[in-house]
């Protein structure tokens, strides 16, 4: 605690500081999302969103943020993703986003309002001042896990998983030694917050790293572990090998081609 106190005084943390123009970026993204990307959310008041976002971390110790702090923001940014249209991902962020860029009716967390606002941003405040800290913010490993960014993603990831229904897809990286990583946000938060009364199937897409690789990565021990966790929660598990991520790139360039329209 004394170390935190000293660090908070001089505001020197192990991670990068708040993203430049953070308040402006949040407002700009909010307006773009609610007015252009998803006009059915045009009722959302972006100033209120920013106030709630700010209220979650400003004047609070950046190592003592709780999920409760983000509840007002979650309430304002509440959004319903249609059944069968939730795409989770783990270490495949770029591919997952290329997919939803084309398949516009499918949503990753970052395709929802709150995920879109915060994607790739860093933020934190300072204890007992109304300042945003642009110099440094707590690093999850070096400093503390209850920092504004980590708690935000844990909170919205939990909510995203809880609200999913029907068939849920997860895109996993077949190039990693642990295809399913229990320590990832997917493995530690989302998997455990899928609701069996709403979600009947979790289908994993294991992305191979190129053509010519004919292995069945759905047989990987970590996938078997995921299957066990999911099955114990009374959710049906299925897994598919996806051998052609190269096609993502082609379709990202020419999304209007009918070969880029796919039912999932």
């Amino acid at each position: 605690v004394s170390r935190w106190h000293q660090q908070s005084q001089r505001s020197q943390w192990g991670g990068r500081g708040t993203t430049d123009r953070f308040p402006e970026i949040i407002l700009e993204r909010c307006v773009e999302y609610t007015q252009t990307l998803l006009p059915e959310m045009r009722h959302v008041d972006c100033q209120n969103i920013w106030d709630a976002f700010k209220g979650a971390f400003i004047s609070k110790h950046p190592c003592k943020i709780t999920e409760e702090d983000y509840q007002p923001l979650l309430k304002l940014g509440n959004q319903t993703v249609p059944c069968n249209k939730t795409l989770l991902w783990s270490r495949t962020k770029h591919l997952a986003h290329q997919y939803t860029e084309i398949q516009r009716d499918v949503f990753t967390l970052e395709d929802t309002l709150l995920g879109y606002l915060a994607d790739d941003l860093t933020w934190c405040g300072e204890f007992e001042t109304s300042e945003i800290n642009y110099r440094s913010c707590p690093d999850w490993r070096k400093d503390c896990s209850s920092n504004p960014v980590s708690v935000f993603w844990k909170t919205v990831s939990r909510r995203f998983a809880e609200s999913a229904c029907g068939v849920v897809h997860v895109m996993l990286n077949g190039s990693c030694s642990n295809i399913f990583d229990k320590k990832s946000t997917f493995g530690s938060v989302e998997v455990h917050n899928l609701q069996p009364e709403k979600v009947h199937t979790l289908e994993a897409w294991v992305m191979h790293d190129g053509r010519g690789d004919s292995r069945d990565l759905c047989q990987d021990p970590s996938i078997k572990e995921l299957e066990l966790i999911i099955s114990k929660r009374n959710i049906t598990f299925s897994c598919k090998n996806i051998y052609r991520p190269d096609k993502f790139l082609q379709c990202a360039k020419t999304p209007e081609d009918s070969s880029c329209i796919s039912k999932i």
Epitope: S214, D216, P245, K247, S259, C260, I264
Partner: antibody
Framework: QVQLVESGGGLVQPGGSLRLSCAAS????????MNWVRQAPGKGLEWVSG????????YYADSVKGRFTISRDNSKNTLYLQMNSLRAEDTAVYYC??????????????WGQGTLVTVSS | DIELTQPPSVSVAPGQTARISCSGD??????VSWYQQKPGQAPVLVIY???NRPSGIPERFSGSNSGNTATLTISGTQAEDEADYYC????????FGGGTKVEIK
């Protein structure tokens, strides 16, 4: 509507060569990967070769690797299969097929009517 | 490469249900497509991505895939459904099953 028309088949002696063509129309040819699939008389379907939309990547079944070459001319909306060192077991109807299925799964939504290649002395 | 095995033939009475199996080691881990081929004609896609029907294919055609078996089901079989049927998957290369002749008794 999508049309694929193969040509260039015929009778050829073992060890000989043949060049098949597939003229495509009714879709943006340069946006699609294309493939050749063959069917020996009274037998099942066998994938032979594939080529990416811009021709930068080519793929072959082990049975034809080193003997067949797939290519395309997007300005002419035409797919080719150059077949060298032909063997009796290459005798088949050769179909040109458009690869569909976006990025999650791969299948052939459109096929030509096929051209017969007979390798015999 | 995955090997896909189909029964050589399936016989069914008109109006009855025909089920064509396509077995392979953990085939449920791969997407499967099905083609119909009538004598002297090119194959026609009837099911893709396990269970999706292209436009123009009658609703009586359906597909499923799990474990070691993918299945094409033709409900209320009609005379025009008499044909050869091939399953196909992809695991770095395209693989076809040997084909099943559906005969309407």
């Amino acid at each position: 509507q999508v049309q694929l028309v193969e040509s260039g088949g015929g009778l050829v002696q073992p060890g000989g060569s043949l060049r098949l063509s597939c003229a495509a129309s009714g879709f943006t040819f340069s946006s699609y990967a294309m493939n050749w699939v063959r069917q020996a008389p009274g037998k099942g379907l066998e994938w032979v070769s594939g080529i990416s939309s811009w021709g930068s990547s080519t793929y072959y079944a082990d049975s034809v690797k080193g003997r067949f070459t797939i290519s395309r001319d997007n300005s002419k909306n035409t797919l080719y299969l150059q077949m060298n060192s032909l063997r009796a077991e290459d005798t088949a109807v050769y179909y040109c097929a458009r690869e569909d299925g976006s990025y999650m799964t791969d299948y052939f939504a459109y096929w030509g009517q096929g051209t017969l290649v007979t390798v015999s002395s | 490469d995955i090997e896909l095995t189909q029964p050589p033939s399936v016989s069914v009475a008109p109006g009855q249900t025909a089920r064509i199996s396509c077995s392979g080691d953990n085939i449920g881990h791969y997407y499967v497509s099905w083609y119909q081929q009538k004598p002297g004609q090119a194959p026609v896609l009837v099911i893709y991505s396990d269970s999706n029907r292209p436009s123009g294919i009658p609703e009586r055609f359906s597909g499923s895939n799990s474990g070691n078996t993918a299945t094409l089901t033709i409900s209320g079989t009609q005379a025009e459904d008499e044909a050869d049927y091939y399953c196909q998957s992809y695991n770095g290369t395209y693989v076809f099953g040997g084909g099943t002749k559906v005969e309407i008794k």
